[in-house]
Amino acid sequence: QPSVSPGEPSPPSIHPGKSDLIVRVGDEIRLLCTDPGFVKWTFEILDETNENKQNEWITEKAEATNTGKYTCTNKHGLSNSIYVFVRDPAKLFLVDRSLYGKEDNDTLVRCPLTDPEVTNYSLKGCQGKPLPKDLRFIPDPKAGIMIKSVKRAYHRLCLHCSVDQEGKSVLSEKFILKVRPAFKAVPVVSVSKASYLLREGEEFTVTCTIKDVSSSVYSTWKRENSQTKLQEKYNSWHHGDFNYERQATLTISSARVNDSGVFMCYANNTFGSANVTTTLEVVDKGFINIFPMINTTVFVNDGENVDLIVEYEAFPKPEHQQWIYMNRTFTDKWEDYPKSENESNIRYVSELHLTRLKGTEGGTYTFLVSNSDVNAAIAFNVYVNTKPEILTYDRLVNGMLQCVAAGFPEPTIDWYFCPGTEQRCSASVLPVDVQTLNSSGPPFGKLVVQSSIDSSAFKHNGTVECKAYNDVGKTSAYFNFAFKGNNKEQIHPHT
């Protein structure tokens, strides 16, 4: 019993004056607490507690369940304890079969003994199975058996407390260990779609999937730059041990333009946090934006191919697309396809393939597209470059030589005189008159140019060359002169 110097408060004294007491089942337990400032007796075993305000604790017929720690406390808060074992051969263990352990921590199998004199107090696997090789434990007859550093692999381990009594092994009722996993990584979070585009009034619904080892992972939807609590619904599943999945679904039943923004799904556990975002854009109505992938003014050489290509954004999805030329709709030669196979794709491509274009096929080619909200169009002006063609070369009644040529771009006509019969003409002759004839005609056809020179300027036999040329090529026509005396004869035009 404790001894202290006079004047200082001292703990109560207990009779019998020993730390442990063994009584047989059915016998009397009589404990006396002596202290001038006695307050109470407290009894504890497992999670059970009982109190007694009388200084003598008497249990007339002891039962195994009376095994436990009896503590006497005085008014100074000082206490003294005695542990009583009630030996019952039919009930060697008191048990609370609740058995939970946190990974990497110790956990107590609560099977205190009613008889401290039995031997080989230990743990055994159920149905004769061995315990895991790395399982370490420390027995304590007054508390139970402490499993050290619980492993995840011990989850659902079935075991018994065991003692040897008179040479025989006696087992307690079975315990099943449930292991709470330690978080050793951040949660895994993913979102159903990275971006959403909606019209006003449509429903916005997005699901965040959170995966972790246990359900105690925390998760929430947040709106960036806002503290407003969002309404979310949960579904969750345990896919076997330590494989937990939660789906947190955020819904805005009728989205408005000012709901646009970035929404974050945030999850954390004791190891750390993770997040994923999705972007919502709400528009008051649908739209179509067209982007030409080549210049809308196109120059192409006669007989060559050209592809007219547009990209366009359409929301909602495009419903009708067409390419038109001269009020005529193309039924083939074009294709229209989404820019990506992504579910949230709003970008598309349309291509019109024009092959072996003729000079007569220049003009305006128009792409039209529509959805349920809007129509849009874009026009391409296609010019076909053609080598000049000499349409007429004549000597007029007034003695003028006239050359008419057509082509695109607009041909230039030059005149040359070749003395004798040479056809390599070098001396240039200035025209008297040059006119572009078809300025009132179709804007994309060939351009016709007329040029005239005065034949009276030529005094010798020879050849006059009319040469029409542009960026694409050149063409010539010739006039032959023959003089008899003072008279000009036989003006033979030829190309």
């Epitope: 059970e48 609740s98 359900s215 041990d241």
Partner: nanobody, 123 residues
Framework: EVQLLESGGGLVQPGGSLRLSCAAS????????MSWVRQAPGKGLEWVSA????????YYADSVKGRFTISRDNSKNTLYLQMNSLRAEDTAVYYC????????????????RGQGTLVTVSS
Amino acid sequence: EVQLLESGGGLVQPGGSLRLSCAASGLTISTYAMSWVRQAPGKGLEWVSAISTGGSSTYYADSVKGRFTISRDNSKNTLYLQMNSLRAEDTAVYYCATGYDSSGHYYGGFDYRGQGTLVTVSS
């Protein structure tokens, strides 16, 4: 075969009371601390209350403290939950279960759990 059979659920107005019972068969409940847990529509399991093997120690979730009382009668192998001052947010299926994790977490299993009884709090 172990069975835990809950009863006593039903429709009650806010502010009203109910007493849930859980009768065990094929199992001696005195060998277990016992718990009540609940699951509200669309939510996960939530631990409500627990009681030690002999009944002298009781534990409650903050959301029910002062309104719910857990008790047991080991001689009848029965667990009880007295629910007073009920609120709409108490609407759930209530389950009795063997075991209690003294760290206050429910994390993936009881040795045994009943089929549940539905409590609906609505005006």
